[in-house]
Amino acid sequence: QRFAQAQQQLPLESLGWDVAELQLNHTGPQQDPRLYWQGGPALGRSFLHGPELDKGQLRIHRDGIYMVHIQVTLAICSSTTASRHHPTTLAVGICSPASRSISLLRLSFHQGCTIASQRLTPLARGDTLCTNLTGTLLPSRNTDETFFGVQWVRP
Amino acid sequence: QRFAQAQQQLPLESLGWDVAELQLNHTGPQQDPRLYWQGGPALGRSFLHGPELDKGQLRIHRDGIYMVHIQVTLAICSSTTASRHHPTTLAVGICSPASRSISLLRLSFHQGCTIASQRLTPLARGDTLCTNLTGTLLPSRNTDETFFGVQWVRP
Amino acid sequence: QRFAQAQQQLPLESLGWDVAELQLNHTGPQQDPRLYWQGGPALGRSFLHGPELDKGQLRIHRDGIYMVHIQVTLAICSSTTASRHHPTTLAVGICSPASRSISLLRLSFHQGCTIASQRLTPLARGDTLCTNLTGTLLPSRNTDETFFGVQWVRP
């Protein structure tokens, strides 16, 4: 109820407070390194307010500077597993439109089983963000271990 | 002086810019895995603007989507220490009210001595966040190595 | 175009939405552990809206609470390299004015090749942030692997 009231008081859409927090749905088929995400109140604590999902990838709806953050934990993992399967790397980037394709954030697991990071980056309406996990290890689907989100910060 | 002026110009409470950054006070007694936090200008660079501390745990005062972040560094640690005492795991979750109890963010140290992460999550007035460190290792009380905070992002 | 419109609608300067995201320019000369940063649209996805660079160090222009974040990846690195060259430590702090000098955030690499973290901290106009990398290993200059930024959160 208080959420609804607050949204009446503040025209959030005009303020541009776009925000999304996603949980892992599944990995891609062979040769597709992308992680596929899902979000929505029915799924627990994930949500999309502004951005949308397009075949499991996050599409931006408002120009601006965004804080992008991610955490990925490998599913069956110990430091020896991680080092044996090295390199396992996660990259977050703009994958479409092709003209704006760029890697925004990249991390390797080395001897760890979790990576987590965040950065500020300009994004434009229509940019689709992809998260590529290279290597043979599978990410955990636990919602407290693997998640991906964006937060609009300013125009 | 500029802080005071800014607060007169912007009714921060109505905007809902609740924010807190805490430093470690101490670990719990045996069988209590919770970390106990402290905050306030007298303690250095920690603060609470909106949220409150309840027996060392952070209680939320305003509904909304929050960015939750944490860094914990182990006090006496090398990669061999960390792996010898594995699993040492940190979990951040809502611990009360019991009806809303859930793990929000979880990380293991594996061969590292520091974990750091952040995520967006909906929180409601009255939610108390607990940070549980399982394992026998002591976290550093240095304010630049171990800290925990939340930032209100939108309703 | 939409960026320009948005800026007309919202007097961002009065709102105080200062924000910066920097990429690594170079390391310092011997005996200078500081990383030197650069930012601006000509360099890719780095930018400064409010804060300024002073000889490669970030200077704050507006009092407030900021979210400070950083990721540093070592250039030629494996878990064995990292552990052999231990301790390699990154510290972010206020380095001037001298009266406000303090370490804000500190991380060691141990057996990893990347550190990433973030924290909320009060900063004042004129504060200069320095990022000190101690040890013999060189940081990667790739813009998706090494970056440093701040975001004004509230007065």
């Epitope: - | 290792l137 304010t143 | 510290a91 303090i102």
Partner: antibody, heavy 123, light 107 residues
Amino acid sequence: QVTLKESGPVLVKPTETLTLTCTVSGFSLSNARMGVTWIRQPPGKALEWLAHIFSNDEKSYSTSLKSRLTISKDTSKTQVVLTMTNMDPVDTATYYCARIRDYYDISSYYDYWGQGTLVSVSS
Amino acid sequence: DIQMTQSPSAMSASVGDRVTITCRASQDISNYLAWFQQKPGKVPKRLIYAASSLQSGVPSRFSGSGSGTEFTLTISSLLPEDFATYYCLQLNSFPFTFGGGTKVEIN
């Protein structure tokens, strides 16, 4: 009342291993946040921090002496033992033990010390 | 490891003098610093903890200040019983490290 008492040989030969014991009373080493440190002082020289052990068995050693030191505590939690291998005449010093009552309370660091024990290294 | 550099290593002073001893840390140690006094043949005695907090029972002529990397121990008016050696100790990160000591001698 809190006391710490060091004991061990007065004289050791070069290349031998030194074993020192710190016996504590008036407090228990059962709290994970509590610990005992060994510190030494060669005659006429400065204090040198050697090693620390917490009740949960976490240990830290002086970097320069790490390869020669081992710190441990006995199961009764009343004794902390320091062993130092390959003794040399330069290791001649008074060896002290001191306590940290609570890692998270800086006012409790090294509030109590033992009287020290002088160890000479000579053939 | 954090290096602690204490200066001067020795000094001569007279009763009633104001004495200042400094300690510099190789990296920021916040306020995690203690000062100890040691007299010949005696156990070190803690004077100051947390950089500036006076140990109970220690006379108020002793004071500590500083934070980060620069620290000072001040004796406002030297008394005969203050002639001793003084050590700083960083308590920020394990392994802890002492400064090299400052011997305060009678002028």
